[in-house]
Interface confidence: low
């Protein structure tokens, strides 16, 4: 499983990550696959 900071759930209400994030019921987006250094 992904264990990096990339996988931390972000706190920007209502935004969906362009790279495949899933907006949860509380509208907090999950960052999927977009981490750059």
């Amino acid at each position: 499983a992904c264990d990096t900071a990339t996988c931390v759930t972000h706190r920007l209400a209502g935004l969906l990550s362009r790279s495949g994030g899933v907006v949860k019921n509380n509208f907090v987006p999950t960052n999927v696959g977009s981490k750059a250094f």
């Epitope: 992904c2 931390v8 972000h10 999927v32 696959g33 750059a36």
Partner: antibody, heavy 122, light 107 residues
Amino acid sequence: EVQLVESGGGLVQPGGSLRLSCAASGFTFSNYWISWVRQAPGKGLEWVAEIRSESDASATHYAEAVKGRFTISRDNAKNSLYLQMNSLRAEDTAVYYCTSYFDYGLAIQNYWGQGTLVTVSS
Amino acid sequence: EIVLTQSPATLSLSPGERATLSCKASKRVTTYVSWYQQKPGQAPRLLIYGASNRYLGIPARFSGSGSGTDFTLTISSLEPEDFAVYYCSQSYNYPYTFGQGTKLEIK
């Protein structure tokens, strides 16, 4: 204007210490995850260490090669990142870049400094 | 540690040609791959993140594709300023790792 400016590099003897700094401006520093990435002369890129954002408890991670010798830290009030390097070895010789990252959800921001050269030699 | 292997090591092409650069991961990294361009004496520049997303201000001739273990950076029509070294990186597992680089040179 967004800027990351590294400083603190120089010539140090094997076994010595050095503290690198990275001064940030033009963006909300505390929101960003920041890494140090190094590049030995004529070689490729190597990740060194990462510190997460203030909201992610400023958690840290290190490459195995530097674990126990290097310490990454940040001072959000000063918009500054640091890398304390102890027990330096010849193989630590490299240009050290700081690079910051933030995900807006719809896009990301990624900034790099121009690097500071660390030379470990007797 | 996840090893990224880039190929070819050197690619010799002419302006206007299409460039295809490969990056293979030793383990599955889903889409946690980025591509960087680096010119001599300069810091790396992010081109692609999340395997296929173009970074801000990056021209449309740059595109990324792939998932799992196989990734590709394509430059559809080379401009003179595109000749540089290109690195892929993964951020799926610690430690973050980079490929060894592909040098894109003018033929």
